[in-house]
């Protein structure tokens, strides 16, 4: 089950908070580090903020990216860092805040053809496989070479958003990562709040489309915190 996957070798050697559970050395499968976890401190409140270890950008909040905290630091230790605002230096799209992308080393305002959520090619090297299959280090697949010559359609498996056709991003759904539509106005979105454990992120959503941001649904203000829905709304 996913629960045994979560406690297997690939996860148990991670730095806290992900490495807290006892592992099952005999597990046949393992999740890519940090993609799924039961609890943990990913959503700490800002005033009690602890760095969240990560292996790829999509494990971080919408306003964060995954990188080594120090320039030229140990590449094996990566945490979620605050995104770079417009006109700040960058090396890839995910470093730039929503609504921007990385062009010539600088975060610039997005146009329709540049979506947030790109994952670096090098990320796949840290997993060595299509990490949607949850079999971390058992084998190396050739999905990218045999499948991605055409852009993925809605619902097809993917490794990163660039594998998906225009208007789609790569997001986790159940046990895999698939191409999902970038969200439109009024659609439910996921707001990554640094607050309490948030359960398994097995239903990742795409980011909101151009000119939209993920905000609390107006008629849900009275609802309890846990049941509040966020939707994509005009800036």
């Amino acid at each position: 089950t996913l629960n045994s996957v979560l406690n297997s070798n690939a996860i148990k050697n991670l730095p806290p908070p992900l490495g807290g559970a006892a592992g099952h050395p005999g597990s046949a499968v393992s999740a890519a580090p940090g993609i799924l976890y039961p609890g943990g401190n990913k959503y700490q409140t800002i005033d009690n903020y602890q760095p969240y270890p990560c292996a790829e950008d999509e494990e971080c909040g919408t306003d964060e990216y995954c990188a080594s905290p120090t320039r030229g630091g140990d590449a094996g230790v990566q945490i979620c860092l605050a995104c770079r605002k417009r006109r700040k230096r960058c090396m890839r799209h995910a470093m730039c805040c929503p609504g921007n992308y990385c062009k010539n080393g600088i975060c610039v305002s997005s146009d329709q053809n540049h979506f947030r959520g790109e994952i670096e090619e090098t990320i796949t090297e840290s997993f060595g496989n299509d990490h949607s299959t949850l079999d971390g280090y058992s084998r190396r697949t050739t999905l990218s070479s045999k499948m991605y010559h055409t852009k993925g359609q809605e619902g097809s498996v993917c490794l990163r958003s660039s594998d998906c056709a225009s208007g789609l991003c790569c997001a986790r759904h159940f046990w895999s990562k698939i191409c999902k539509p970038v969200l439109k106005e009024g659609q439910v979105c996921t707001k990554h709040r640094r607050k309490g454990s948030h359960g398994l992120e097995i239903f990742q959503r795409c980011y909101c489309g151009e000119g939209l941001s993920c905000r609390i649904q107006k008629d849900h203000h009275q609802a309890s915190n846990s049941s509040r829905l966020h939707t994509c709304q005009r800036h």
């Epitope: 089950t1 996913l2 629960n3 499968v29 299509d130 949607s132 299959t133 949850l134 079999d135 058992s138 084998r139 697949t141 999905l143 045999k146 499948m147 055409t150 993925g152 359609q153 809605e154 619902g155 097809s156 498996v157 759904h173 159940f174 046990w175 895999s176 698939i178 999902k180 009024g186 659609q187 439910v188 996921t190 359960g199 398994l200 097995i202 239903f203 959503r205 049941s227 829905l229």
Partner: antibody, heavy 116, light 111 residues
């Protein structure tokens, strides 16, 4: 257009075996996870199993674990369900479904009847 | 065992709006801002109507909408039409069993 056609259903005695097939067309079969979902006569839907696009991961409902095996042949665009140690409660219409963003396409189903 | 609870039946007149509820627990429906809905006419295969709480696949009428609050999800059909008469199933994910779960189904009758 997307088409899923199940076959292999029929009457089988308790304890017997059956192998269902699902022929897929109209989409890149090797790019999608696939599932089996069943529906007992007059009852609701019950998820049975799912297989990843490259066959490396499989999941099963507790009710069929250890008895059913899901598999696929991407070169033939075909999904399979090997059902062993069949019980009366396995009697149902078995649907194969494309597991894209949820079960976005379904076959017409094939009826499996387990009876002595 | 049915993990998600739906009313066995609901009814409405043409042009009316009806809502079908789907109640789960914190380990399934309540644990994720995620639920899907399927429509099934007698003798036919199910059809995906709503995914990710309130998203409609292309080709599905905008008379169908979804919402969720806490452990309960809802499917609302406005401007009820005769062809809406069918069984409706909600679907989510159950973390303890690591599996897909369906509701028991609701029979919608258009009077």
């Amino acid at each position: 257009q997307v088409q899923l056609v199940e076959s292999g259903g029929g009457l089988v005695q308790p304890g017997g075996s059956l192998r269902l097939s699902c022929a897929a067309s109209g989409f890149t079969f090797s790019s999608y996870w696939m599932s089996w979902v069943r529906q007992a006569p007059g009852k609701g839907l019950e998820w049975v199993s799912v297989i990843s696009s490259d066959s490396s991961s499989t999941y099963y409902a507790d009710s069929v674990k250890g008895r059913f095996t899901i598999s696929r042949d991407n070169s033939k665009n075909t999904l399979y369900l090997q059902m062993n140690s069949l019980r009366a409660e396995d009697t149902a219409v078995y649907y194969c479904a494309r597991h894209g963003i949820d079960f976005d396409h379904w076959g017409q189903g094939t009826l499996v009847t387990v009876s002595s | 065992d049915i993990a998600l609870t739906q009313p066995a039946s609901v009814s409405g007149s043409p042009g009316q709006s009806i809502t079908i509820s789907c109640t789960g627990t914190s380990s399934d429906l309540g644990g994720y801002n995620y639920v899907s809905w399927y429509q099934q006419h007698p003798g036919k295969a199910p059809k995906l109507m709503i995914y990710d709480v309130n998203n409609r696949p292309s080709g599905v009428s905008n008379r169908f909408s979804g919402s969720k609050s806490g452990n309960t999800a809802s499917l609302t059909i406005s401007g009820l039409q005769a062809e809406d008469e069918a069984d409706y199933y909600c679907q989510s994910y159950d973390s303890p069993t690591d599996s897909v779960v369906f509701g028991g189904g609701t029979k919608l009758t258009v009077l």
